[in-house]
């Protein structure tokens, strides 16, 4: 007769491993007992269990509650056992020794490989700013046994690079995603996708991109020159810009302090009923943590009693 077993048995961490050991003998041959031991335990084998045809299963204290026989129906020539809830420390070499009558003793070895699913982590790169060159947006690292696959899922244009380090039968894989930051990428998702034989489905970690930028500033409100005349109510200037982080606005008058009654409300400068004193050069200063921009406009308030036209000059500066 001969023993039938597997060269390598593979199990996912936390699942049950079947360690096969089947005696294929001639008719009339019987299996008296099957002894299972850890064969790579250093000095002397570490016993797992003894399977006796008459007295049943005896499990050694170190494996109490973790070794069982497969569920019925059982073949008396089958010395296979189940190792419950496999952990990484179970990975290694196992030996079954089968005592038969009348053929004598047989032994076989198998190797148990425990697949360890990865726990991926995503680390954002340095702050992204418009105008930078190729910049690290994020890196994603996953370690498992065997090596995980790390890829990226995103609409954003970029380049990836990977590096791996092997550690015995596990491996750590790091993938980096580089891009040239632009404001259009703001709020876009960048998803790290990790695949592994021990995972039922891919693991996904999403990072939302934030790109710092500040658009050119401009001022609205002076489009219709005829509206800026003495006595007009509700006149206002609005400063237009866009940024990430959202910018703050500040209004000043270049040729003196803001006239009394002029209200600053964020990006808007509100005027009381217009007088010629409101004529002047007004500056909108836009800033965020990334940059600052200025836009200035010249306001000429028309006095209908004077026979002169109103002039408006718009000047932008950064």
């Amino acid at each position: 007769g001969e023993l039938e077993t597997s060269d390598v048995v593979t199990v996912v961490l936390g699942q049950d491993a079947k360690l096969p050991c089947f005696y294929r003998g001639d008719s009339g041959e019987q299996v008296g007992q099957v002894a299972w031991a850890r064969a790579d335990a250093g000095e002397g084998a570490q016993e797992l269990a003894l399977l006796h045809s008459k007295y049943g299963l005896h499990v050694s204290p170190a494996y109490e509650g973790r070794v069982e026989q497969p569920p019925p129906p059982r073949n008396p020539l089958d010395g296979s056992v189940l190792l419950r809830n496999a952990v990484q420390a179970d990975e290694g070499e196992y030996e079954c020794r089968v005592s038969t009558f009348p053929a004598g003793s047989f032994q076989a070895r198998l190797r148990l490989r425990v697949l360890v699913p990865p726990l991926p982590s995503l680390n954002p790169g340095p702050a992204l700013e418009e105008g930078q060159g190729l910049t690290l947006a994020a890196s994603c690292t996953a370690e498992g046994s065997p090596a995980p696959s790390v890829t990226w899922d995103t609409e954003v244009k970029g380049t990836t690079s990977s590096r791996s380090f092997k550690h015995s039968r596990s491996a750590a894989v790091t993938s980096e995603f580089h891009l040239v930051p632009s404001r259009s990428m703001n709020g876009q998702p960048l998803t790290c996708v990790v695949s592994h034989p021990g995972l039922l489905q891919d693991q996904r970690i999403t990072h939302i991109l934030h790109v710092s930028f500040l658009a050119e500033a401009s001022v609205r409100g002076l489009e219709d020159q005829n509206l800026w005349h003495v006595g007009r109510e509700g006149a206002m200037l609005k400063c237009l810009s866009e940024g990430q982080p959202p910018p703050s606005y500040n209004w000043t008058r270049l040729d003196g302090p803001l006239p009394s009654g002029v209200r600053v409300d964020g990006d808007t400068l509100g005027f009381p009923p217009l007088t010629t004193e409101h004529s002047g050069i007004y500056v909108c200063h836009v800033s965020n943590e990334f940059s600052s921009r200025d836009s200035q406009v010249t306001v000429d308030v028309l006095d209908p009693q004077e026979d002169s036209g109103k002039q408006v000059d718009l000047v932008s500066a950064s």
Partner: antibody, heavy 115, light 113 residues
Framework: EVQLVESGGGLVQPGGSLRLSCAAS????????MHWVRQATGKGLEWVSA???????YYPGSVKGRFTISRENAKNSLYLQMNSLRAGDTAVYYC?????????WGQGTTVTVSS | DIVMTQSPDSLAVSLGERATINCKSS????????????LAWYQQKPGQPPKLLIY???TRESGVPDRFSGSGSGTDFTLTISSLQAEDVAVYYC?????????FGQGTKVEIK
Amino acid sequence: EVQLVESGGGLVQPGGSLRLSCAASGFTFSSYDMHWVRQATGKGLEWVSAIGTVGDTYYPGSVKGRFTISRENAKNSLYLQMNSLRAGDTAVYYCAREWNGMDVWGQGTTVTVSS
Amino acid sequence: DIVMTQSPDSLAVSLGERATINCKSSQSVLYNSNNKNYLAWYQQKPGQPPKLLIYWASTRESGVPDRFSGSGSGTDFTLTISSLQAEDVAVYYCQQFYTTPYSFGQGTKVEIK
């Protein structure tokens, strides 16, 4: 019987290419990480590359970008594609199986890089 | 990268006497999660491929005579041949398989005095 048999060695000029093969038998090839290790005459052992069970690959700096390891599990075969060969690559090349350390080795195939 | 350094480079020992080879790694090869040292010892005889003797620093490979033993942890390791036999004449290498790039020691040649 567990066995590894290398082939593909030979004489090649500097800058040339060579592809080594390693035929595995007697074990479940797809379940093992595999390696190439080389040894120049009278010198010590130098690790050249490794490939994991899912095709992940590893190289030392001395061969990175020039050598490519691959495997074909259906054919129980391991390969090493060597490009831009240099005189310093002259050695016996062994393929080896890894479990805890490299527990099975082939007999090696000789690569000579010379003009 | 981890550098492995063996000492001595060569060793002459009388038959039946003890031979001791040392191996030092430039950084620890002890994996804390399982308390195993990822260090192996190999024997290479002339014209033959290397043969695995010891793994996890101290576990003998199946079929290796018990006169071979390994010890040590972290960065310092020792291979001991308790009673040198004629067939033990060879070059012995240590190797770390803690992380890539894997690296070997330069080898120690053991001869009979």
